[in-house]
């Protein structure tokens, strides 16, 4: 199922910035999703549940995000990607077992001025 | 080696249009490269060699192209991708044997008007 996760629109525009969507299987209950910019961890979101099923979200890098039952979307300013960078979603699955780590969708993002005044978005199949 | 071919910039801007680059191994001497737009064959380029090593190029769909020893680039007008389509490079290798067919790089392309007046390019890792 993880192999199918690249089949979504990874990048889109959102309020003048870029929304990067990292999909994961709906069966996943507890996870860590990291967004890499080149080799640097740009965002790091962990969703876990305690012994009483209480949900805790850790977002140590304070990335604006939106979490659903099958995706984590991170919101970046255009400036964050103006130099051209490779972005990668990396998923760690804690629950259900077994523990898994997977590199999911990835893509190269470049924003630059254009006389055409258009936006070109390409994302993984 | 074929597995490494996605690691290039599939899409780029060129003279007001879009250049879609389909890479292949330098060892390939004779090939057919097809560019799919969704499920439709948009471009079809075949390079073969005759008994005297004479190169023949077939381009039945008359796509503007550029051929090198390791890539075929097709040039599309923006209008060709303005609706948002999935593009896929499909390679058939005739020489050297054995005959092989491979789907190479693919990506989703969407061009639309922007108030930001910028171009956003994302391409496969």
């Amino acid at each position: 199922e993880l192999n199918d996760l690249a089949n979504h629109r990874m990048f889109s525009f959102h309020d003048g910035g870029v929304q990067i969507s990292c999909n994961y299987p709906e069966t996943v209950q507890q996870l860590k999703m990291q967004l890499f910019k080149d080799r640097e961890v740009l965002c790091d979101l962990t969703k876990t549940k305690g012994s009483g099923n209480t949900v805790s979200i850790k977002n140590p890098m304070s990335c604006p995000y939106q979490l659903s039952n099958n995706s984590v979307s991170f919101f970046l300013d255009n400036a964050d990607s103006s130099q051209g960078s490779y972005f990668l979603c990396s998923l760690s699955i804690f629950d259900p077992p077994p523990f898994q780590e997977k590199n999911l969708s990835g893509g190269y993002l470049l924003i630059y001025e254009s006389q055409l005044c258009c936006q070109l978005k390409l994302w993984l199949p | 080696e074929l597995n490494d071919l996605a690691n290039h910039r599939m899409f780029s801007f060129h003279d007001g249009g879009v250049q879609i680059s389909c890479n292949y191994p330098e060892t390939v001497q004779q090939l057919k490269m097809q560019l799919f737009k969704d499920r439709e064959v948009l471009c079809d380029l075949t390079k073969t060699k005759g008994s005297g090593n004479t190169v023949s190029i077939k381009n039945p769909m008359s796509c503007p192209y550029q051929l090198s020893n390791n890539s075929v680039s097709f040039f599309l007008d923006n209008a060709d991708s303005s609706q948002g389509s999935y593009f896929l490079c499909s390679l058939s290798i005739f020489d050297p044997p054995p005959f092989q067919e491979k789907n190479l790089s693919g990506g989703y392309l969407l061009i639309y008007e922007s108030q930001l007046c910028c171009q956003l390019k994302l391409w496969l890792p």
Partner: antibody, heavy 117, light 111 residues
Framework: EVQLVESGGGLVKPGGSLKLSCAAS????????MDWVRQAPGKGLEWVGN????????NFAPSVKGRFTISRDNAKNTLYLQMNSVKSEDTATYYC??????????WGQGTLVTVSS | DIVMTQSPSSLAVSAGDKVTINCKSS??????????LIWYQQKTGQAPKLLIF???TRHTGVPDRFIGSGSGTDFTLTITSFQTEDLGDYYC?????????FGPGTKLEIK
């Protein structure tokens, strides 16, 4: 190897206070929810409470709510249980346990708390 | 709060016996395809040890003679061939909601 070592147990008078500690090693402490579970002599297991990674979320069993507090120091890899206004029914062996996402997968050896005048 | 009950409260067994311990919850523990039910073993003077989680998944290193089954409100821990080292108390626990609660336990003794 995951290790949890409780300390701080002992004899305490009814109405008194006691602070238990649990030193964790062998894993990234801040990645896990941590819990306290107790067991009265000759009785079954009773969940006391838990705390999330950063100490932002803390839950308690109804029997200890308002009297016990749980905290953690991730820099010291230590979990704490502050027991106030203790009662005789709080007499038990107190275990700290790591919540391994879907079960208590590691337990300490326990520390005995006796509430008696 | 969800109430957990276990039966029997104690059981006298011999080596090689098939042992069945039952656990019942006051409401369904099934959510998103998973039963939020755990089994622990506790030997005298020791801390509990995890045996089974999600009602039927054996924890790492647990012998395959321990089998968890059941769904919803009714669960069973089966020891297909009891060994003397299996002596001790067995507890079920839910983690469906807060507070997580344990069953009262089942004590296995030698016949």
């Amino acid at each position: 190897e995951v290790q949890l070592v409780e300390s701080g147990g002992g004899l305490v008078k009814p109405g008194g206070s006691l602070k238990l500690s649990c030193a964790a090693s062998g894993f990234t402490f801040s990645d896990y929810w941590m819990d306290w579970v107790r067991q009265a002599p000759g009785k079954g297991l009773e969940w006391v409470g838990n705390i999330d990674h950063d100490g932002n979320i803390i839950n308690f069993a109804p029997s200890v709510k308002g009297r016990f507090t749980i905290s953690r120091d991730n820099a010291k890899n230590t979990l704490y249980l502050q027991m106030n206004s203790v009662k005789s029914e709080d007499t038990a062996t107190y275990y700290c346990a790591r919540w391994g996402h879907y079960a208590f997968d590691s337990w300490g050896q326990g520390t005995l708390v006796t509430v008696s005048s | 709060d969800i109430v957990m009950t276990q039966s029997p409260s104690s059981l006298a067994v011999s080596a090689g016996d098939k042992v069945t311990i039952n656990c019942k919850s006051s409401q369904s523990l099934l959510s998103s395809g998973y039963n939020y039910l755990i089994w622990y073993q506790q030997k005298t003077g020791q801390a509990p040890k995890l045996l089974i989680f999600y009602a039927s998944t054996r924890h790492t290193g647990v012998p395959d003679r321990f089998i968890g089954s059941g769904s919803g409100t009714d669960f069973t821990l089966t020891i297909t061939s009891f060994q003397t080292e299996d002596l001790g108390d067995y507890y079920c626990q839910h983690h469906y909601s807060s507070p997580p609660t344990f069953g009262p336990g089942t004590k296995l003794e030698i016949k």
